[in-house]
């Protein structure tokens, strides 16, 4: 007997062909001999089966001797043997309907687990293989699990169900809820305005939740909450903000924070958390602020940086268009009795300048 695989919610067309290429009488029945559908002249007739309002045929094919049974909005329980009776002969087709669903939601937080569950008819023994958007293959039986979802797991998962040497393909769209970047560093000169941006790696119709930015200043012994906010349908409203610093926040996505000026006492690391409505767990993004100050005090020219810098960063002091006078993997450098001219303080990583501050040294008379 012919085997046809179907997908839950889809439409399947079971074929039945007569030797005579003309419209003749036919009937489709299920394994319990209950009439599903047939014809009378140019019209469809329907029996008392549970498929009544989901069964159809194609009248346009009848005069070619084809009498298909179309079943719409397939259910697992539609799995059965269907019998087509035409010209005193019987054609049997076994229909097996499968469903593949994400156990929880298809919108999952980064780091959470994804479980895919296969619904299958009794007596079937299918195998499943899924391919993630980044090309990772996972295999299983009734359930497949992927732990620690990453941002690259966002997208269409393609799963193939194999049964009786036949296969049916499912596509499931998974959205991993995360910030575009896990971490970012902002380099600023003292006194400059600081812009922090927290773009999301996903788009959804309605986004509701609440968030907070905790800040650990390098000079402080403990961290403190700089700002708390609510998100309602992609609109941002500030709930509470510290007096120092007085942060400002954009009203629309992406989440955007402005620090009026970069000061050494603000240099450090922050953690922005976002709790989304109806989701357990939070989204996190780390943000770092490095502040540079160049000063001249009497005969001493000093350049300092505060904040989380890597040990491989180089801090240099140089006179414009000249070789560096001093260059060290430290957070402060100085030059005694600097000659007059425009001095540059540079923070660089493998020759690439991350931050630059200029200071004019006047001639001493």
């Amino acid at each position: 007997k012919k085997v046809v695989l179907g997908k839950k919610g889809d439409t399947v067309e079971l074929t039945c062909t007569a030797s005579q290429k003309k419209s003749i009488q036919f009937h489709w029945k299920n394994s319990n001999q209950i009439k599903i559908l047939g014809n009378q002249g140019s019209f469809l007739t329907k029996g008392p089966s549970k498929l009544n309002d989901r069964a159809d045929s194609r009248r346009s094919l009848w005069d070619q001797g084809n009498f298909p049974l179309i079943i719409k909005n397939l259910k697992i329980e539609d799995s059965d043997t269907y019998i087509c009776e035409v010209e005193d002969q019987k054609e049997e087709v076994q229909l097996l309907v499968f469903g593949l669903t994400a156990n929880s939601d298809t919108h999952l937080l980064q780091g959470q687990s994804l479980t895919l569950t296969l619904e299958s008819p009794p007596g079937s023994s299918p195998s499943v293989q899924c391919r993630s958007p980044r090309g990772k293959n996972i295999q299983g039986g009734k359930t497949l699990s992927v732990s620690q979802l990453e941002l690259q797991d966002s997208g269409t998962w393609t799963c193939t169900v194999l049964q009786n040497q036949k296969k049916v393909e499912f596509k499931i769209d998974i959205v991993v809820l995360a910030f575009q970047k896990a971490s970012s560093i902002v380099y600023k000169k003292e006194g400059e305005q600081v812009e922090f941006s927290f773009p999301l790696a996903f788009t959804v119709e309605k986004l509701t939740g609440s968030g907070e930015l905790w800040w650990q200043a390098e000079r402080a012994s403990s961290s403190k909450s700089w700002i708390t906010f609510d998100l309602k349908n992609k609109e941002v409203s500030v709930k509470r903000v510290t007096q120092d610093p007085k942060l400002q926040m954009g009203k629309k996505l992406p989440l955007h924070l402005t620090l009026p000026q970069a000061l050494p006492q603000y240099a450090g690391s922050g953690n922005l958390t976002l709790a989304l409505e109806a989701k357990t767990g939070k989204l996190h993004q780390e943000v770092n602020l490095v502040v540079m100050r160049a000063t001249q005090l009497q005969k001493n020219l000093t350049c300092e940086v505060w904040g989380p810098t890597s040990p491989k960063l180089m801090l240099s002091l140089k006179l414009e268009n000249k070789e560096a006078k001093v260059s060290k993997r430290e957070k402060a450098v100085w030059v005694l009795n600097p000659e007059a001219g425009m001095w540059q303080c540079l923070l660089s990583d493998s020759g690439q300048v991350l931050l630059e501050s200029n200071i004019k040294v006047l001639p001493t008379w």
Epitope: L37, Q40, G41, S42, F43, L44, N52, R58, R59
Partner: antibody
């Protein structure tokens, strides 16, 4: 042009029979069904059944089974609907209509003007 | 059998207005199997729409049909004096074919 011409009005007594004719012209009679639809005064449309002029196959709703006979004469491109055991509630205008099967679509595109049948003692 | 229910029974509108007629099937049917007919007093019905949304030959563009499942709609975008009539929906999803009770569109 394509048209269906029906026979004239009839007055019948309860228990009698009536036979309404429907003559087709302007198209190949055997290529399309003829449907019969009736309408009591001030009421809606009620489908009675059909005849396939090519095969002679017919079908009718359960309500009329055993009382209605649908036939055709291909040589004169005419379809007939005979309703027996008439009762007062059969008083209505009886229409014949051409049934078209176009792809998966079926519709009645050409109608006769109707035949008034009055059942009264 | 499938019962077709039309609403409202009567629609009182002025020429130029938009008419929206509803037809509900007692069970889900394919849009392939839904037709609309217009009938004027003393006349035979006239085919307007078949397959839920396809206009029959010679039917003006102001008539449009839509819907799926159990709910279908006939819309007349701007009523003309000749459009005041009774409108019937009809299904041929399966036997017996059934008509709705009709909606009378009358001049306000």
């Amino acid at each position: 042009q394509v048209q269906l011409v029906q026979s004239g009005a009839e007055v019948k007594k309860p228990g009698a029979s009536v036979k309404v004719s429907c003559k087709a012209s302007g198209y190949t009679f055997t290529s399309y069904d003829i449907n019969w639809v009736r309408q009591a005064t001030g009421q809606g449309l009620e489908w009675m059944g059909w005849v396939n002029p090519n095969s002679g196959n017919t079908g009718s709703t359960q309500k009329f089974q055993g009382r209605v006979t649908m036939t055709r004469n291909t040589s004169i491109s005419t379809a007939y609907m005979e309703l027996s055991s008439l009762r007062s509630e059969d008083t209505a205008v009886y229409y014949c209509a051409r049934g078209v099967l176009k792809g998966d679509y079926y519709y009645m595109d050409v109608w006769g003007k109707g035949t008034t049948v009055t059942v009264s003692s | 059998e499938i019962v077709m229910t039309q609403s409202p029974a009567t629609l009182s509108l002025s020429p130029g207005e938009r008419a929206t007629l509803s037809c509900r099937a007692s069970q889900s049917i394919s849009s392939t199997y839904l037709s609309w007919y217009q009938q004027k007093p003393g006349q035979a019905p006239r085919l307007l729409i078949y397959g839920s949304s396809t206009r029959a030959t010679g039917i003006p563009a102001r008539f449009s049909g839509s819907g799926s499942g159990t709910d279908f709609t006939l819309t007349i975008s701007s009523l003309q004096p000749e459009d005041f009539a009774v409108y019937y929906c009809q299904q041929d999803d399966h036997l017996p074919l059934t008509f709705g009770g009709g909606t009378k569109v009358e001049i306000k």
